[in-house]
């Protein structure tokens, strides 16, 4: 039950997470104008990673979309790449944890695929987020970088030359959007790996009973299993989870990988 | 089409108020900034200052600040501007105006004359 | 606050002759975010409220004729009318929309010569 509950929660941690990490990255204020010297401007501008947008005192906003990829700086590209892949894993992640989820039942999968599922979506979800807070770091060291370097700056205008003070810019809404988001995923990836460990099949040492008339000898065989009667050789091969005693052909599995997680 | 009304002519004695209202119509009154302007005679354009549409908030210019009051009654699309302790120098033409794209001024009312005599 | 010069203070013109009109702000008006000027223009005559004719320094509001033009950028812009008409005959003003307070120019009188 804990497993279930840990599963689904993470599964919802990052969900919200991913969907956050979807916002950031489509919100255009990852840069504000910063207000400290003029707190009552008349043009207000903002800036996200896909467009820039201003906003007047009249409450027209007009935005332009950044129309060309070699012209954008290079820290800019990385982090559209960081956030973009960060999406991409979280979406896949989305899907994997899906099938992954205990209470959700697809045909006869077997507990440990769904172990392996709920790992590699797990993973996922952890990479997604870092990839969405190292994007947002980038973007924010970028920013006071700037904040501080931005003196003056020369535009050529129809009037020749003219001297203008630079805009300065700050932390936007979508920094603190997606750092929240990366770190909901991060945990929800975290709670997925640890939901995994409950889901793997345990390497557990039962005695083996055997149950068998007299003449008939119990044969020991190599591999793992514990014993086996003389009927011939043991094919079942599954699992079952009911608590109570185990005969000797519920086959004991080999550990997996996910046992040391 | 747009228009914005404003009242009559006014002359008042020093120390007295007035308040001078600007009536909208043609658009929704509460989308648009309404700005003030001032024009005493045979000078130049004044800006007193502005009200924020969404807020109601006003902002007013520094030699605005003080005796000038801008208000808003949304259920009647009218703005309006109080001057209390009028004084001579407060004699001029008043026009409301809404604040548009380019932080311009594109409709005007047609000005209302407050006079301040004794 | 921006302060807003215009020259000259008073202009006589010809009919049909060209008319120019500067002005000259203590700041820069151009926008960074969106490389625009936020400068305009206004014609006021007698007797009546001021009319808009050029925002963002050269884009023409919509039914003034196409005889008015406005260039420049940062702190220096022009209005220009290129064939002076009769009903052109008015007080011009140039306006900050940078940044609060709004401010005028003085006005620019546009006479017949």
């Known amino acids: 039950m804990a497993v279930t509950a840990c599963q689904g929660l993470g599964f919802v941690v990052s969900l919200i997470g991913i969907a956050g990490i979807i916002a950031a990255t489509c919100m255009d204020q990852w840069s504000t104008q910063d207000l400290y010297n003029n707190p009552v401007t008349a043009v207000f501008n903002y800036q996200g990673l896909w467009r820039s947008c201003v906003r007047e005192s009249s409450g027209f906003t007009e935005c332009r979309g950044y129309f060309t990829l070699l012209g954008l700086p290079a820290m800019l590209q990385a982090v559209r790449a960081l956030m973009i892949v960060g999406i991409v894993l979280g979406a896949i992640g989305l899907l994997v944890s899906i099938f992954a989820l205990k209470c959700i039942r697809i045909g006869s999968m077997e507990d440990s695929a769904k172990a392996n599922m709920t790992l590699t979506s797990g993973i996922m979800f952890i990479v997604s987020g870092l990839c969405a807070i190292a994007g947002v770091s980038v973007f924010a060291n970028m920013l006071v970088t700037n904040f501080w370097m931005s003196t003056a700056n020369m535009y050529t205008g129809m009037g020749g030359m003219v001297q203008t003070v630079q805009t300065r810019y700050t932390f936007g809404a979508a920094l603190f959007v997606g750092w929240v988001a990366g770190g909901l995923t991060l945990i929800g990836g975290v709670m997925m790996c640890i939901a995994c460990r409950g889901l793997a099949p345990e390497e557990t040492n039962y005695k083996a009973v055997s149950y068998h008339a007299s003449g008939h000898s119990v044969a020991y065989k190599p591999g793992g299993f514990k014993a086996s009667t003389g009927f011939g050789s043991n094919t079942k091969n599954k699992k079952i989870y009911d608590g109570g005693a185990r005969t000797e052909d519920e086959v004991q599995s080999y550990p997996s990988k996910h046992d040391y997680v | 089409q747009i228009q914005l009304v404003q009242s009559g002519s006014e002359l008042k004695k020093p120390g007295a108020s007035v308040k001078v209202s600007c009536k909208a119509s043609g658009y929704t009154l509460t989308n648009y900034g309404m700005n003030w302007v001032r024009q005493a005679p045979g000078q130049g354009l004044e800006w007193m200052g502005w009200i924020r549409p969404n807020t109601g908030e006003p902002t007013y210019a520094e030699d605005f600040k003080g005796r000038f009051v801008f208000s808003l009654d949304t259920s009647v699309a009218t703005a309006y501007l109080q001057i209390t302790s009028l004084k001579a120098e407060d004699t001029a033409v008043y026009y409301c105006?809404?604040?548009?794209?380019?932080?311009?001024?594109?409709?005007w009312g047609q000005g209302t004359l407050v006079t301040v005599s004794s | 606050d921006i302060v807003m010069t215009q020259s000259p203070d008073s202009l006589a013109v010809s009919l049909g002759e060209r008319a120019t009109i500067n002005c000259k702000s203590s700041q820069n008006l151009l926008n960074s975010g969106n490389q625009r000027n936020y400068l305009t223009w206004y014609q006021q005559k007698p007797g009546q409220p001021p009319k808009l004719l050029i925002y963002w320094a050269s884009t023409r509001e919509s039914g003034v004729p196409d005889r008015f033009s406005g260039s420049g950028s940062g702190t220096d812009f022009t209005l220009t009318i290129s064939s002076l008409q009769a009903e052109d005959l008015a007080v011009y003003y140039c306006q900050n929309g940078y940044s609060f307070p709004f401010t005028f120019g003085q006005g620019t009188k546009l006479e017949i010569k």
């Open positions: 105006a809404r604040l548009y794209r380019g932080n311009t001024l594109d409709n």
